[in-house]
Each structure stands twice: as C-alpha cells, then as structure tokens.
C-alpha cells in the first residue's frame, strides 16, 4: 500500500554546511546571454514543451517567465528571423481554465495577448512579433532563463541549508 | 498563421557582460540542505508531478535525479515519517515503454526497484523505505536538487556570456 501524504518531518540538522557568503551568478555561462537581470539561452534545436521544460530544469534554469510587455519586447528584439518560434514557461491549466506560468502565477489580462486556442494541451510560444498558443506536443525551439543576481547573499546560521 | 520552425539567428553580440571569474554554488541556499555534492529542497506543500517539475525549474533546479542505490538510501534517511511521499524526476515514457529520468536517461534494471504500474501517466515517488509509481496527477510533496559545484570556472574573455 502506498504511503499517505502527511506532514513533513525531514531531518535537516545533520546536513548543515558552514555559513559562508554565497557568491551568486556574476555573469552568464557560455552559450547564454545577459538581458538585464537574466541570463537567457535560446535553443537551436527543437523539443515539445514538456521536454523543453525538462531541459531547462536539468540546466538548473527555468523556461522563460515574462514579467511585462517591456520584457516581452526586449526578448523579441533578440529574435532576428520572423520564422522562428520559442516555447516559454506558460501553458493552459484545464482545471483552472486559465493561462498559467510555470511558477504558478496566472496570466493577467493586461499582460501578453495570446493568439490561438486556450484549451487542454495548449502551450505558449513567442515569435519576433507575436505570442501564440500551440499544441504542447509540437516541436519548437525554447528559451531558458537564469536569474542574474549580483548581490552576495549572507546565509543565516540558523536557517536550513 | 504560425511561424514555421526554421533556422535560428538570435543576436548574441549586443549583450556581452564583462568577463569575471564566475563563482559557482559554494554552499546551499537557505531552506536547502547539502547531501554530498547536491543541495536538496524537500517541499512542504503538495503538487502533481508536472507542477513539481515546474516548481523545481523556477527555482533553477531539477526534480531529484538518483544515481544509484547509495544515493537513494542517503535521501531516504532524511525522511523521518513513514507516511510521507516525495516525487522524484522519473516517469514512464509511453513511446519508449520505459522509465525515464527527466535528463533523458532510462532507468537501468539494477537501479531502483519500483513498486506499482509501469504505464501511461505513471510517475515515481520515494518514501522512507520504498520507491513507488503513482498517477502523475496525484498531489504529493517533491524534492528539488541543485548540483553543488565547488570549482570556480573561468569564463573565457572572448566567449559569449
């Protein structure tokens, strides 16, 4: 019988690390480019949306999350071919009947305007000029992002590590 | 009409950053714990497998990838409640009729022994003592990982950043 879902009691005491200053990402890795406070990786090869999500994840990054129209425009300005499409971290949540970013937030009405169906298995991609929805199983290029943090965070000695 | 998938010409010249030594992760962030060469985050909340994958991705990490039985045991030793289950980065690939890690590798026969069905929409979770499969839509806790890299990488001055 499978264990039930209950409250968590993970032992975090035995695995503390020394408290030191943790240097964050100071510039972007090879193949990535800096766009304001992010490092972006524009893929050349293609994948379904789920595989794109997994690829970014194994690179310890996220499919692109777009904060506002300005960020959308900045990103689109880096796409110099009208025929290219890139998956971003937004898909349709059937249960919530809404477009949902992979960080759990919903698309607000004054954000991106999506051309295409809002239905099950719909995922979102951007081109040079527009934002579209397409079947998530379609193979497309994708964009991964890493936050570029210039601040060095102090790790509190009594927090979990 | 949606743009076709074609050749890529993203401008990577205009977004160079200064070349500096890029410090990698030297210790684990707050709430994460170090387990050998990884930082692990054990969630408190629950999610379907896909949302768990997305959550790790937005944390610039990956759902847990387990190399061998030793790593499985080390991870299970951190779970101190028999009733708790955590999604890991392994699910059933229907097209390939095999268990597949999210980094694209297949489960080898001498790795984890999975109790439960190997079928469409089956994802894998671990408990204190075992490894199970369950419908991916089931809400469960999950474990994210970041690789803990102690080496400082030099970024080449003429490379893209």
């Amino acid at each position: 019988q499978k264990p039930s879902i209950g409250k968590c009691s993970v032992d975090i005491q035995q695995n503390r690390t020394k408290t030191t200053e943790r240097p964050d990402l100071l510039n972007c890795p090879i193949y990535w480019q800096q766009v304001q406070e992010k490092c972006l990786l524009f893929s050349h090869t293609v994948n379904p949306w789920n595989n794109s999500l997994a690829d970014c994840s194994t690179k310890e990054s996220s499919l692109l999350l777009i904060q506002d129209k300005d960020e959308l425009t900045r990103t689109q300005n880096l796409i110099h071919d009208k025929a290219i499409s890139f998956w971003i971290g937004l898909n349709f949540s059937l249960s919530e009947k809404n477009w949902k970013w992979i960080n759990g937030s919903f698309l607000s009405s004054n954000d991106l305007k999506i051309t295409g169906d809002a239905k099950e298995n719909s995922c979102v991609y951007i081109s040079q000029t527009s934002v579209y929805s397409e079947y998530c199983s379609t193979e497309m290029k994708w964009i991964c992002q890493k936050e570029l943090t210039l601040v060095r965070n102090k790790v509190s000695p009594d927090s979990w590590l | 009409q949606k743009p076709s998938i074609g050749k890529c010409s993203v401008d990577i010249q205009q977004n160079r950053t200064k070349t500096t030594e890029r410090p990698d992760l030297l210790n684990c962030p707050i709430y994460w714990q170090q387990v050998q060469e990884k930082c692990l985050l054990f969630s408190h909340t629950v999610n379907p497998w896909n949302n768990s994958l997305a959550d790790c991705s937005t944390k610039e990490s990956s759902l847990l990838l387990i190399q061998d039985k030793d790593e499985l045991t080390r991870t299970q030793n951190l779970i101190h409640d028999k009733a708790i289950s955590f999604w890991i980065g392994l699910n059933f690939s229907l097209s390939e009729k095999n268990w597949k890690w999210i980094n694209g590798s297949f489960l080898s026969s001498n790795d984890l022994k999975i109790t439960g069905d190997a079928k469409e929409n089956s994802c894998v979770y671990i408990s204190q003592t075992s490894v199970y499969s369950e419908y991916c839509s089931t809400e469960m806790k999950w474990i994210c990982q970041k690789e803990l890299t102690l080496v400082r990488n030099k970024v080449s001055p003429d490379s893209w950043l």
Epitope: N51 | I5, I12, Q13, W101
Partner: antibody, heavy 121, light 107 residues
C-alpha cells in the same frame, strides 16, 4: 563509457541502398539532437543530416535531400541513416556525432569511429 | 548556405612555432563557430566552441578568437602531436557547414 559506434557500411552499386546504424552509450541519448557527417576520401567534412532529440524534426543537406532518411530509436539508443539511390559521390566515411549541449545541433564533442560506404559498380 | 573559407589551406611549421589559422564566414555568424582537429584515419576532435571556449581536456596552447565573420585558431607553441588537419564549423544557421580544412605539416 561514453561512445558512438557506427555500423552498416560496405560496398554497394549505384542506385542501391544501405542502412547505417549508430549505437550510443554512456550519455542521455534521447536528450540530444544527433547528426551524420561524412568525409569523402582525401576530402573535407560535410554535414549530411540532423534529427531532434524526440525525432520529430529532421534536416538534410541539399546533396542528399529526398534520398536519405535520418531516424532514431531512443529506447534502443540508436541513430539510423537510410540511404537510397546511392551515387558514386556518396562514397565516404560516415560519422555520427553528438553536440556538446542538448540545446544545439552542433559543436560536436563526441564522434563515432566512422563506417565506410563505397558506391561503385 | 553559409560558406566558410579557411586560410591557408596548408602550412609548414616547426615544433615550438606559433601557428595561426583563419576562418571567414560568408555572412555574420556571431560567435557560433567551432574548431576541430583531425588526424589521418581518425574522427575529428572538438578543440574550441563558441568561437573562443576551450573544450575540456584540450591543451591551453590552443585558443580561438573572433566574432561576426572573421575567426582565428592559434596554436601558441606547436607540439609534435599537433600536426594534423584543422576544420572550422558554423552552427549559426542550418545547414551546418565546415571550412575546407587547413593541414599543418612538419617543415
């Protein structure tokens, strides 16, 4: 061990067919796009074809378009090249190659040893 | 298709010499350029990617530079094992293309 091993080459008459295979091991094969690259005797390198990680997208050099078909079986960690209507100018050593990064087609960090295809009557 | 023109097509040099090979693209390819070394009867070996990044395990006497259309591979002090043919390759756009090769021979 991380490696690629080609097989299936040999002598074939013009107009004939061959199927090359490339067995991959030691890396997450299904994550990477894969390519075939060839080298005619005493000549330079020529990219032939590429296929995406899940296999749904393929590209070909103009010189082989309509005659060659690239495919893959991720459950068997194997890449294929079906070559039909072979011509004398297809005579070459055929290499399969893996890119350094799973987001890209090229910058090939892993090559097979190659398999020789000879088209002659 | 993007053409890559390598020069010289061959170069004679001695151990210890500094050798420079150039690769010119027919249109801008940003930094999407790699360099390979190939010895007779062997598969090519990746030396440099992203125009200037040294592949793991490659000696530091190899370096790459350039962006846009003009690229250079430099061997700072030629060693006996460096006598081989060198190819540049672009992946800015498909089809992937290679330069014609530069043979580095013993003087």
């Amino acid at each position: 061990e991380v490696q690629l091993l080609e097989s299936g080459g040999g002598l074939v008459q013009p107009g004939g067919s061959l199927r090359l295979s490339c067995a991959a091991s030691g890396f997450t094969f299904g994550t990477f796009a894969m390519s075939w690259v060839r080298q005619a005797p005493g000549k330079g390198l020529e990219w032939v074809s590429a296929i995406s990680g899940v296999g749904g997208t393929t590209y070909y050099a103009d010189s082989v378009k309509g005659r060659f078909t690239i495919s893959r079986d991720n459950s068997k960690n194997t890449l294929y090249l079906q070559m039909n209507s072979l011509r004398a100018e297809d005579t070459a050593v055929y290499y399969c190659a893996k890119p350094l990064d799973s987001s890209f087609w090229a910058d090939f960090d892993l090559w097979g040893r190659g398999t020789l295809v000879t088209v002659s009557s | 298709d993007i053409q890559l023109t390598q020069s010289p097509s061959s170069v004679s040099a001695s151990v210890g010499d500094r050798v420079t090979i150039t690769c010119r693209a027919s249109q801008t390819i940003s930094s999407w350029l790699a360099w390979y070394q190939q010895k007779p009867g062997k598969a090519p070996k990746l030396l440099i990617y992203a125009a200037s990044s040294l592949q793991s395990g490659v000696p530091s006497r190899f370096s790459g530079s350039g962006s846009g259309t003009d690229f250079t591979l430099t061997i700072s002090s030629l060693q006996p094992e460096d006598f081989a043919t060198y190819y540049c390759q672009q992946q800015s756009v498909l089809p992937i293309t290679f330069g014609g090769g530069t043979k580095v021979e013993i003087k």
